[in-house]
Structures are given as C-alpha cells and as structure tokens.
C-alpha cells in the first residue's frame, strides 16, 4: 500500500490496533522490513507498507483526521469529501474525523443528505455499522452531541465554536461519500440546534448532549421539528434526571404554532404537549448547579408523528360538575406488545395536554379530545363512592346506579363503572333492586348480555364475591350486610344500544346479620341457577347467605342440587343448610359436612334456603350450586 498526503491537506492518517481480540496470531504493519503495530502518516508524508497477516481488518483500524481551521482564514464550506478516497485505503474498519475550529460568533451547520440520521442511545449499535459521532465545544471542553445511524429524521445540526464529526465505516461498506456538507451560519447563541424532519408518520428518539451523562451546566439546546401540515406531533419524555440547581430552574420550552403563550414553559416532570399541528421547537434549558452537589440534568424523549383521526378535531364535554366522589379514567386496554411501529393513542385535555391515560374528577366540566388511530385501543373505567355517615339521615334513602349519559356519549368503550357503597358499620345494610330481574352467571347458564353487574364486598379484609349478574333472570333483589362494590362491566360495544336495560337502585335499610339475601321469583319458562358466593374459592368462614324463593300460587317449584355432597370439611364448627317453608314455617336442617344433599324436592309454596358455613379446612371449601324449575300445579304431585 502507498498512502501519500499532500502538504497542505491538514490530513493525518493513523493505523492502530483496534479492540483487542482473542486471535491466536499477532499481526503487524510492515514498513521496509520493520514490524510495528502503529503507523502515523502526517501531511506531506508518503509511506509504503504491507501487513504481515491475511486479515488485518481483524486487528487494525484506520483513522483519517482532517483539521479544518476557520479561525485564521475562510472556511472550506460545501460537501465534505472522503479524502483519501476509500479505494486507496487498506481494507480496515475506518473512521473519518473532521475537526472544525471556529470563532464563538460563527455558527456551523452540518447538513445531512437523505437518508437522514437517527440518534441512538448508549449500548445501541447501527445496523451495518455505519455510525456518525458528533461533538461540539464549549471553550476547551468537548461536548458529545450524540451518536447517529442512517435512516432517521435528523437533517441538520447547528453548532458554534467548532465541531468534531466522526464517520465510522466498517471494512466491508462500499460507501465512498461522507453524506454531509458544512455551511456557515450566524451565531446560534446556544450549544446546538438539531433539526428533525418528518416526511410522514413515524417516531424519533432524541437525547440531550452528553447523554447519559449530564447536560452541560446552564446551557441551552434546541430541537426544531418539521412536521407535515396534515399530521400531528406528540412529545413524551422517556427518561430524565434533574440536577441540583442553585440559580434558575431547569425547564423545557416549546414554540408551538398558533399558541398565544409562546414560549410555553414546562417542567421536565410535567405532561408534555401533544396533538400539535405544524412545525414546533423544543428547548432544554439548564441551570446554575450547586458546586458541592451538582447532580445531572439529562433527557431522552420521543416525538411521535401521526395522522389526526376524525375524533381529534372533535371536542367532547364530560360534565362531572354535578357528580360527587367520582373519577373517570381513560386508558389503554391491555394488549400484546408488537415490534412494529404503532401510532400513539392519546387522550387530550383541552386539546393540548395529551397522554396515554387521563383521569377526570368530579366537580368540574372537562373538555377532551382524542389523538388515536383506533379508539378501540382505549377504554374507560369509572369509580364512584356513595357513602352514608349518619344512619338516621340515610335510612330508606335510595340512589340510582346508572352510567351518566355524558359518559355513554364518549367514543371510547366503557369497561367498568364501579360504585362503592359504604354504610356505617353495624347500623345499616343495603338492598339492590334492578330495573330488570337479574340472572346469576354460572357455567351452566352463562350470561350472554353486553354487560353484567359484579357484586363484591368492599371491606378490605373480606374476600367475598357475591357473583356476576346480568339482566334477564329471576333475581328481584340482593340484600347485603355491609359495604360492597357494584361494578357494571361491559363485554361488547353493543352496550350502548342496551344501556336502557341497565338500572339498579340501592337503598339503605336497617342492619341485618346475614352476609347476603337473594330474593328470587323463578320464571315459568326456564331453570334458575343459583350458586353460593365466592364460587371456586369457597364461601368464606362462618358466613351465612339465604335465598328467598317465591313460588307462584299456580306453580310447583322443584329444588335440585348439583352434587350429592358438598365436599366441605370443617376445621371448627358445623356447616348447615336450612330449607324452610315460609307458610308453615316447617324446616329441615342438613349438616353439609356430614349429610348428603337432599334429592330433588317439590315446594308448593315460597320457601327459604339458608346456608351457614363453618371454618373449612384448606382446599375443602363450601361451594354449592342448585337450580329451581317451576311446573304448573295441575299435575298432582302429592
């Protein structure tokens, strides 16, 4: 090989050992029979050399550094050439370095031809290994602007006082152009400006200078985003740290088109703006740090650019001003993560503060809009507390458990609407009366409606789930001893059409001791399946529940149990079932941990089924399923 560098070229070539590898044989650069592991060629020198091994690319790297001095004379602006040409260089991994020194008052602009650059974070590498490393200068200190690959959005980087640009090319890469040019600009009065151009939908991840180390003290860095007019941009901070400020405050500032409050100033911990139309700037401003304990300021953020949906231009009013103790959350429904680019899905408050989830609270009117490619990716969860503190005031008071129409009009599916019903302990109980009689969901007769009511205890220490109930059954009311949560859960978008079927009234009633009482009026046409609360986990210890089963005058009810035995094993106490005729008060008592369950039996009159649990042994719980059917009384069954 022969490398000759012209005297005025300001180019230095250095061939040196690369990352040490566990290669058995050493390799040398051979210069007139002399073996060496490093070769430096300066301007005006011409050197002939060879390598002592077949694959020097496994051992050596070549660095070609060109110093460009803009202090003492005019700057050679324009497209930057790879000199010497790659075809004249040995087949090694090569790094071309351009070190430009300029006055503080001069701005330097690096312009990247298409494909533009994509910034990578620590530990990431570029496919194919072509990497740009860009540094700036503050007085004598070198500041890393970032490491970049091809195929991104970064089109220009402006700096002042100098720039060091390194282009790393692996030995096998055919590239023979630098891919960038240098232009002079007026002073930018900050560390740097990075321009990021979006042609269409996509995202860009960007980082503050020196990331993941600290951003230089009291410096200013700006990103300019060029966004097509028909698209919208949203900013989210992926990672940030704040330093310890002595004076001034670290912040980000946005220049947003159409904003009357430019610049809009945000703390790094604030929700960042979204749904922005048109070009915008984002600037990171550092502070004067505490000399003893400076900490570090750093920021990694993402800009997501996507099509606005029809919904993003619509404003929805959610009026919770007349609601009390209510919170509404719009959030992403859980999905499997995909590796493809997925446009963001945001909900925006007042069209500007956009985030992946949003919680609205009662007492106000809220204006929201959406920036989302597909609103089925979101759902709503609402919680409302209805509590009674004074039993004298609440007794016999009723509340309607209905989803407010404002919520139903939103273009997002309702997932859960939960009412937490709280009563004074041992003073009052609750009764739930549905607008339409309810069916209990069982494996044997599942609910197939678009929504169900999930009823569970709301006492933290108590694990008691009464069951899931949907309209279209035989349960006329559910009485519960103490605090419960009633959750209306939807299962299909058709809930909006069926919303008229919802409707549950809760009333505060005098206290009673049983955990729950179900009032059932069976339908003549179908079996009524009923099961004990906490199905599959077992009725809690020492819990008592009852079913008040009405039998119409002209009918006979057949009560059938699913199993011959309950399988419950009591650790302490006994588990009982009492079946009592309501008219005659005649009752039969069955020991559930000893006796077989009764065979199918007929009741001519309304009757009670009461189940009281013992303290069961682990794994030997009390679960009971039974059903009631009606037949006309004309058949003589006596």
């Amino acid at each position: 090989f022969e490398i000759a560098l012209p005297r005025e070229s300001n180019i230095t070539v250095l061939i040196k050992l690369g990352t040490p590898t566990l290669l058995a044989k050493p390799c040398y650069i051979v210069i007139s029979k002399r073996h060496t592991t490093m070769l430096s060629i300066k301007p005006g020198e011409r050197i002939l050399f060879t390598f002592s091994c077949q694959s020097p690319e496994n051992h050596f790297v070549i660095e070609i550094q060109k110093n460009i001095d803009c202090m003492s004379g005019p700057c050679p602006f324009g497209e930057v050439q790879l000199q010497p040409s790659t075809s004249l260089l040995p087949t090694l991994n090569r790094t071309f370095i351009w070190d430009v020194k300029a006055h503080k008052s001069i701005g330097l602009e690096l312009q990247f031809s298409i494909p533009r650059l994509r910034q990578i974070g620590p530990g990431e590498s570029c496919p194919g290994g072509v990497t740009y490393s860009i540094s700036g200068r503050i007085d004598a200190t070198v500041v890393r602007i970032g490491t970049f690959c091809s195929n991104g959005t970064v089109s220009r980087i402006k700096m002042q006082e100098g720039v060091k640009m390194a282009l790393h090319l692996p030995w096998f890469h055919p590239r023979n152009v630098s891919g960038f040019s240098i232009a002079n600009r007026s002073s930018i009065k900050r560390l740097c400006i990075i321009e990021s151009v979006f042609e269409g939908e996509g995202s860009a991840t960007l980082m503050s200078a020196n990331y993941p180390e600290g951003f230089p003290e009291d410096e200013l860095m700006t990103w300019q985003f060029v966004i097509p007019a028909h698209l919208r941009a949203s900013v989210s901070f992926l990672n940030f740290n704040l330093s310890n400020c002595e004076r001034k405050e670290e912040r980000v500032e946005y220049y947003i088109p159409g904003s009357t409050t430019n610049p809009e100033v945000f703390k790094l911990e604030d929700k960042q703006p979204g749904n922005m139309a048109g070009n915008f700037n984002l600037s990171l401003q550092g502070c004067d740090q505490d000399a003893q304990n400076p900490g570090i300021l750093r920021l990694q953020f993402q800009v997501l650019v996507q099509h606005p949906q029809n919904e993003s231009n619509k404003i929805y009013v959610v009026d919770l001003s007349n609601e009390r103790a209510t919170s509404l959350t719009i959030e992403p429904r859980p999905v499997k993560q995909s590796r493809k680019f997925v446009p963001g899905c945001f909900v925006c408050l007042e069209s500007r503060t956009c985030s992946t989830n949003l919680t609205l609270t009662s007492g106000s009117k809220h204006k929201i809009s959406f920036l989302c490619d597909n609103l089925t990716r979101l759902w709503m969860n609402v919680e409302k507390n209805i509590s009674c503190t004074d039993h004298r005031y609440c007794q016999r008071k009723s509340y309607s458990l209905q989803v407010p129409s404002d919520i139903l009009h939103l273009p997002v599916e309702l997932h859960d609407f939960s009412w937490k019903l709280l009563v004074p302990k041992d003073r009052l109980s609750l009764v739930l009366v549905p607008a339409q009689k309810l069916q209990q969901h069982t494996h044997e007769k599942p609910c197939n409606t678009s929504f169900s009511y999930l009823v569970a205890s709301a006492i933290p220490s108590q694990d008691l789930y009464f069951g899931s109930f949907c309209p279209g059954g035989s349960i006329e009311q559910i009485q519960v001893k103490q605090n419960i949560s009633v959750t209306l859960r939807t299962f299909a978008p058709s809930f909006r059409q069926e919303a008229s079927r919802q409707g549950l009234t809760v009333s505060f009633i005098p206290y009673f001791k049983e955990e729950g009482v179900f009032t059932v009026t069976p339908d003549t046409k179908s079996k009524v399946y009923l099961r004990t609360p906490n199905w599959d986990r077992g009725l809690p210890s020492l819990t008592s529940v009852s079913w008040n089963i009405s039998v119409p005058r002209d009918q006979v009810a057949c009560l059938t149990f699913f199993k011959e035995r309950t399988g419950v094993v009591c650790q302490t106490g006994r588990a009982f079932m009492i079946i009592q005729e309501q008219r005659t008060r005649a009752e039969e008592i069955f020991s559930l941990d000893e006796d077989a369950l009764p065979k199918p039996r007929f009741h001519h009159h309304s009757f009670w089924v009461n189940i009281s649990n013992c303290s069961p042994a682990s794994g030997k719980q009390l679960d009971l399923l039974f059903w009631v059917t009606l037949t006309p009384r004309t058949v003589d069954l006596t």
Epitope: F51, C53, Q54, S55, P56, E57, N58, T91, W171, F172
Partner: nanobody
C-alpha cells in the same frame, strides 16, 4: 493472484429463492472476512451481508430475515441463500474478500426478480 467467481444468478419470480456461490482460487481465504455487495440498475453499490473468519454474520436491514450468508472453508467458497425474493432485489451481486488489507472482487452475477 486471488480470484473470485460468482455463480447461481438468474431469473426468478417474486417470492422465489436462489442460492449464489462465490468460489475463491489462487489463495486460501478461510481466515478472511467475506462480503456480498449488489448494484441495482442505475443505483450505487450497496452492502448486503458479511461473514467473518469465525463465522459471525451481519446483514443489511433490507435483507434481514430473508437472506443467509454462509461459507465452506474446505471448498474456499461462500454462499448467499436468498429467499422470499422481491423485485427490488434485482441487481448484479458481487462477492468480495478482504485479503492482506486489499479487497478482491468477483465480476458479479445478475439476479432478476420479475413475474
């Protein structure tokens, strides 16, 4: 003098497969890195895949998951298995080897993907 000869090119329908070979003669290249480049009509040369002497591989994004580079050191030969071919894969494919700091190239083989 080290020489490289590519073979295996031809006309194939989109979605089809081809296997290119690159035979080296004049020197043992088992300890050398080898590479495939391609040049589409009217375009610049682009890197496709590379294989080191130890057998580690790297692919351009445009072919990742579709092309596989391999080598048979005993036969002094490198291969490029190309599956799920697309019209944009149409190009002259060149193989190269890094040998004593020089890159030696073959004359190329034409791959045409068309229906």
């Amino acid at each position: 003098q080290l020489q490289l000869v590519e073979s295996g090119g031809g006309l194939v329908q989109p979605g089809g497969s081809l296997r290119l070979s690159c035979a080296a003669s004049g020197s043992d290249v088992s300890a050398n890195g080898m590479v495939w480049h391609r040049q589409a009509p009217g375009k610049g040369r682009e890197w496709v895949a590379v294989i080191s002497s130890s057998g580690s591989t790297n692919y351009a994004d445009s072919v990742k998951g579709r092309f596989t580079i391999s080598r048979d050191s005993d036969k002094n030969t490198m291969y490029l298995q190309m599956n799920s071919l697309r019209p944009e894969d149409t190009a002259v494919y060149y193989c190269g080897v890094a040998h004593y700091g020089q890159t030696y190239w073959g004359k190329g083989t034409l791959v045409t993907v068309s229906s």
